[in-house]
């Protein structure tokens, strides 16, 4: 039975040209995290595998950095980076947990972080 909860950074905003950290945290389960995938819509950005470490998709190598922790850092942001991002936790013996983050990349300097929220 899947009892875990994913907490994410929720709805966030950042300035064009800047960087942002995407963070998820899995709690309320004793399941072992074997891998975390980071996706933008249906594109795989990066994988953090418990056995192998990090793998960044070749098309994102220049602008994506692993960490901190199981999070992901997006750099040199453009307006095209606005959209949904997903952290997908593969766990034994539970299964698959998914968290959602919405990033808005702004032209001005009024970007502020949104509130945290939880996804069951």
């Amino acid at each position: 039975m899947m009892t875990g909860t994913i907490e994410t950074t929720g709805n966030i905003s950042a300035e064009k040209g800047g960087s942002i950290i995407l963070q998820c945290h899995l709690s309320s389960t004793t399941a072992q995290v074997t891998q975390v995938n980071w996706e933008q819509q249906d594109q795989l950005l990066a994988i953090c595998n418990a056995d192998l470490g990090w793998h960044i998709s070749p098309s994102f190598k220049d602008r994506v950095a692993p960490g901190p922790g199981l999070g992901l850092t997006l750099q040199s942001l453009t307006v095209n980076d606005t959209g949904e991002y997903f952290c997908i936790y593969h766990t034994y013996p539970d299964g698959t947990y998914t968290g959602r983050i919405f990033l808005e990349v702004l032209e001005s300097s009024v970007a502020e972080h949104g509130a945290r929220f939880q996804i069951p």
């Epitope: 074997t34 418990a50 056995d51 192998l52 034994y92």
Partner: antibody, heavy 119, light 107 residues
Framework: DVKLVESGGGLVKLGGSLKLSCAAS????????MSWVRQTPEKRLELVAA????????YYLDTVKGRFTISRDNAKNTLYLQMSSLKSEDTALFYC????????????WGQGTSVTVSS | DIQMTQSPSSLSASVGDRVTITCKAS??????LNWYQQKPGKAPKLLIY???NLQTGVPSRFSGSGSGTDFTFTISSLQPEDIATYYC?????????FGQGTKVEIK
């Protein structure tokens, strides 16, 4: 070309043991999660056991826990399934499968090796 | 365990027909649904992963859709080589269960 070749199947007595092997080639074996899927005579598919790329994590179907052991030798590019205390319901065609790097699905399957448990 | 129910269990259609198979999960599985094709005497082959993503090398006449509990697999124009049994499989919760299969035949 990705190739998965199973061996070790056969006819075994009730309560007996058998060890299946899967020789992998055409890809970096040590980078992929691998598993065993069986297909019963009624054509039902079941994920029996899985093992992470480095062998740190294993999963077993409840009905085989304590009887089956999945393992891998990354130096030999080989996946194993040690089966003991075999039951008649273990009769099936056993497939060796590779998982996508994303772990979303099994993207390659071997041709299978048949296991028949008889009394 | 999550039960996966496919319908129909078998179907017969003509070459060029649009063929649709449905898969229903007993609980929410988000988009964690895969489709496999198994030709007689062969191993299953991955066609669609994560509900709608076409696996590399798979013809574009195959497609998938759905989320939550209801999913659809479509062959837009049935070809003779599509004679096979098609299985759905959920990847949300262990054990990752399969549907019972849908056998597709040519009229």
């Amino acid at each position: 070309d990705v190739k998965l070749v199973e061996s070790g199947g056969g006819l075994v007595k009730l309560g007996g043991s058998l060890k299946l092997s899967c020789a992998a080639s055409g890809f970096t074996f040590s980078s992929y999660t691998m598993s065993w899927v069986r297909q019963t005579p009624e054509k039902r598919l079941e994920l029996v056991a899985a093992i992470s790329s480095g062998g740190s994590y294993t999963y077993y179907l409840d009905t085989v826990k304590g009887r089956f052991t999945i393992s891998r030798d990354n130096a030999k590019n080989t996946l194993y399934l040690q089966m003991s205390s075999l039951k008649s319901e273990d009769t099936a065609l056993f497939y060796c499968t590779r998982w996508l790097l994303s772990l979303y699905a099994m993207d390659y399957w071997g041709q299978g090796t048949s296991v028949t448990v008889s009394s | 365990d999550i039960q996966m129910t496919q319908s129909p269990s078998s179907l017969s259609a003509s070459v060029g027909d649009r063929v649709t198979i449905t898969c229903k999960a007993s609980q929410n599985i988000n988009v964690w649904l895969n489709w496999y094709q198994q030709k007689p005497g062969k191993a299953p082959k991955l066609l669609i992963y994560k509900a709608s993503n076409l696996q590399t090398g798979v013809p574009s006449r195959f497609s998938g859709s759905g989320s939550g509990t209801d999913f659809t697999f479509t062959i837009s124009s049935l070809q003779p080589e599509d004679i096979a049994t098609y299985y759905c499989q959920q990847g949300q919760t262990y054990p990752f269960t399969f549907g019972q299969g849908t056998k597709v035949e040519i009229k």
